[in-house]
Interface confidence: low
């Protein structure tokens, strides 16, 4: 049974004679008259087992002492620390030539842990040990023991274990303690990587490369490596680990972010408090959940506050000009905490009798600068129908509006367009052509914008180039133009009139009268 003694963390003790309780029982040769096991008191009055020999009067001493088998435990190099006292030969009368002040240290590697005899020729000499301090008779009287400490190392070792031996050649020695140990680089954590206990290399200059493993809840950034030096010190840390998302470094560990905190990426250094309007109720959160009614857009970073759709635009003003409307408004009171606000225009055409019966305006209406994604707070809407009720909604939108489309985000106004002149006539056709007449027909304008009172036909000879033209008016959508010259090209234009005035003339229709009495019937815009 061994008692525990405290040694440096980088030393692993294989044998410590001072920790053994009871007899050491090492093997001595010769069995009698050489090394002898003696119990003495140490500086704390604790009994310790020592081996002593003091055959200084007799010549040719060869006294051997061998330890029990010492396991190697994977060490390739071991260290032997010997604490001993040695008597000064000059203080002993009449021992000149026989008294020595050194002893020899040997080792022998073996896989056999039960060798009973000392075979001197098997042992390999490690060194001759001399004392730095020797004591005299006076010192003994004053109970001053001059303790020497010598350390030697041996390696590389390869067998399961080994024996140590001490050879006395005629000195007066007390082996107070023998400790055998090897050196390791102790388990350590550097840069969030754990490096295991590592036994040092076989020789005193070797470095052992060790790959570290990332601590719990961390991941490799660069492969973590260190070198274990021969003295049991870690050298040259390379690479590192990073705490996973949801974890941060605390006291060399990766601990989960506390509730109310988060860490989105392993490359972030520490957990951050949840941004405004968000929370986390799990430890180890990698993102925070938005409060009810708040949202994150797809491209919002986890560090951004959660935001809301904006409130409705304010102060919507309309200005009707015949079949055009100009709308202006003010920014919403609450932008929802975002900068990416824009506006969409919704146009609804509503029945005069029942304003609740509305339907979309369709593609014929035009918006300047645009209908959706407006960055300005005004829009011009044209090509509306006259005498019609319209409802215009202005929607304020931002990057999170799609998550919660809410009527509170829009403001609306209802207007009635004024009387306006009709639009131009799209299609005029020559239905019959004779020597002296042309029968014309046309379609109603796309947008009459009211009741059409009459149509006006303007015509002239093509080579007169509108210098001399004639007008014919009719309430119908067709008319016969008579009194024309034969074999002559004429140009015809038609326009409609309402109470609001004339519309634009149609595109020119060119027709050539005939030379023969018979009639020619045509549909084209340029009948000949």
């Amino acid at each position: 049974v061994t008692g525990s003694r405290v040694y440096p963390a980088n030393e692993v003790t294989l044998l410590d004679s001072r920790s053994v309780q009871g007899e050491l029982g090492w093997i001595a040769s010769p069995l009698e008259g050489g090394w002898e096991e003696v119990s003495i008191m140490d500086e704390k009055n604790t009994p310790i087992r020592t081996y002593q020999v003091c055959n200084v009067m007799e010549p040719s001493q060869n006294n051997w002492l061998r330890t029990d088998w010492i396991t190697r435990e994977g060490a390739q190099r071991v260290y032997i620390e010997i604490k001993f006292t040695l008597r000064d030969c000059n203080s002993l009368p009449g021992v000149m030539g026989t008294c020595k002040e050194t002893f020899n240290l040997y080792y022998y590697e073996s896989d056999n842990d039960k060798e009973r005899f000392i075979r001197e020729n098997q042992f390999v000499k490690i060194d001759t040990i001399a004392a730095d301090e020797s004591f005299t008779q006076v010192d003994i009287g004053d109970r001053i023991m001059k303790l020497n400490t010598e350390i030697r190392d041996v390696g590389p070792l390869s067998k399961k274990g080994f024996y140590l031996a001490f050879q006395d050649v005629g000195a007066c020695i007390a082996l107070v303690s023998v400790r055998v140990f090897y050196k390791k680089c102790p388990l350590t954590v550097r840069n969030l990587a754990q490096f295991p206990d590592t036994i040092t290399g076989a020789d005193t200059s070797s470095l052992v490369e060790v790959r570290g493993s990332c601590v719990n809840n961390s991941e490799e950034k660069d492969v973590p490596k260190m070198y274990c030096g021969a003295d049991g010190e870690w050298l040259v840390p390379i690479g590192n680990c990073l705490c996973n998302a949801g974890h941060e470094e605390r006291s060399g560990e990766c601990q989960a972010c506390k509730i109310g905190y988060y860490k989105a990426l392993s490359t972030d250094a520490t957990c951050a408090k949840c941004p405004p309007h968000s929370y986390s109720v799990w430890e180890g959160a990698t993102s925070c959940t938005c409060d009810r009614g708040f949202f994150r857009a797809d491209n919002d970073a986890a560090s951004m506050p959660c935001t809301r759709p904006p409130s409705a635009p304010l102060n919507l003003i309309s200005n009707v000009n015949e079949t055009s409307v100009n709308l202006e408004w003010s920014s919403p009171q609450n932008t929802g905490g975002r900068q990416d606000i824009s506006y969409n225009v919704v146009c609804k055409k509503c029945g005069a009798g029942d304003p609740s019966k509305c339907r979309p305006c369709g593609s014929g209406v035009h918006y300047t600068p645009q209908q959706n994604g407006l960055k300005t707070t005004k829009v011009s809407i044209t090509d509306l129908l006259a005498h019609t009720n319209y409802t215009f909604e202005i929607w304020a939108v931002n990057g999170v509006s799609k998550y919660n489309p809410n009527p509170d985000q829009s403001v609306s106004v209802t207007v009635t367009t004024n009387q306006a002149a009709p639009s131009s006539i799209a299609l005029v056709q020559a239905k019959e052509v004779t020597r002296y007449s042309v029968a014309l027909a046309w379609l109603e304008p796309d947008r009459p914008n009211g009741v059409i009172l009459e149509y006006e036909v303007k015509y002239y000879e093509k080579d007169q180039n509108e210098r001399s033209y004639r007008i014919v008016r009719t309430a119908a959508r067709n008319t016969d133009i008579k009194g024309l010259n034969p074999l002559t090209s004429y140009v015809f234009h038609v326009r409609a009139r309402t109470a609001a005035g004339y519309g634009d003339f149609s595109e020119p229709l060119e027709v050539t009268t005939n030379t023969v009495p018979s009639r020619i019937i045509g549909d084209g815009a340029n009948s000949t």
Epitope: A245, L265, V281, W282, E283, T289
Partner: antibody, heavy 120, light 110 residues
Framework: QVQLQQSGPGLVKPSQTLSLTCAIS??????????WNWIRQSPSRGLEWLGR?????????DYAVSVKSRITINPDTSKNQFSLQLNSVTPEDTAVYYC??????????WGQGTLVTVSS | QSVLTQPPSVSAAPGQKVTISCSGS????????VSWYQQLPGTAPKLLIY???KRPSGIPDRFSGSKSGTSATLGITGLQTGDEADYYC???????????FGGGTKLTVL
């Protein structure tokens, strides 16, 4: 509407492995706002949380200390399901096993439950 | 032995009010949200209350939750025979790094 459908044997022999699967519809096992849990219930133990799997840019697992050495919970993204494996079972593991979705520390959707009896 | 402590049973007449307590510690109820579950015989538990006092859609406002310090309470007013069930509280335990439940309370409507 989220639904969880459990499947797996109701009888397991002692020392063998208990295996159950939970198929998800109406949500994704890879959702980054939910965790997918296994919970069991027995007269002696009451409701006992066993563990969960969840995805937050990578997969994570958390397990109860009482079963940590024996439990594995795996997601299967291709089938949108997750599974429970409990090794070296004993009669003490006899219970009704539930899968459940955890959204912010409350279990808002549960599977129908599977009674697993450990007996030879 | 459950981490959270609930009374084994409570009872009241139809139309009456009943409360069920759930006691824990600072590592669970004290620093985390509490949820409550109703388990009708032969069925899976059903979420009644989350985040201490919020009701999922479809849960009538007869059910309410509250939390104070390291204890939480479930309240049920206007008791109905259909409310006869087992009720469980649950929360996260920061020390155990696990979800923990109470032992359950059997509600009897007299």
């Amino acid at each position: 509407q989220v639904q969880l459908q459990q499947s797996g044997p109701g009888l397991v022999k002692p020392s063998q492995t208990l295996s159950l699967t939970c198929a998800i519809s109406g949500d994704s096992v890879s959702s980054n706002s939910a965790a997918w849990n296994w919970i069991r219930q027995s007269p002696s133990r009451g409701l006992e949380w066993l563990g969960r799997t969840y995805y937050r840019s990578k997969w994570y697992n958390d397990y109860a200390v009482s079963v940590k050495s024996r439990i594995t919970i795996n997601p299967d993204t291709s089938k949108n399901q997750f599974s429970l494996q409990l090794n070296s079972v004993t009669p003490e593991d006899t219970a009704v096993y539930y899968c459940a979705r955890d959204s912010l520390r409350s279990f808002d959707y549960w599977g129908q439950g599977t009674l697993v009896t450990v007996s030879s | 032995q459950s981490v959270l402590t609930q009374p084994p049973s409570v009872s009241a007449a139809p139309g009456q009010k009943v409360t069920i307590s759930c006691s824990g510690s600072s590592s669970n109820i004290g620093n985390n949200y509490v949820s409550w579950y109703q388990q009708l015989p032969g069925t899976a538990p059903k979420l009644l209350i989350y985040d201490n006092n919020k009701r999922p859609s479809g849960i009538p406002d007869r059910f309410s939750g509250s939390k104070s310090g390291t204890s939480a309470t479930l309240g049920i007013t206007g008791l109905q025979t259909g409310d006869e069930a087992d009720y469980y509280c649950g929360t996260w335990d920061s020390s155990l790094s696990a979800v923990v439940f109470g032992g359950g309370t059997k509600l009897t409507v007299l």
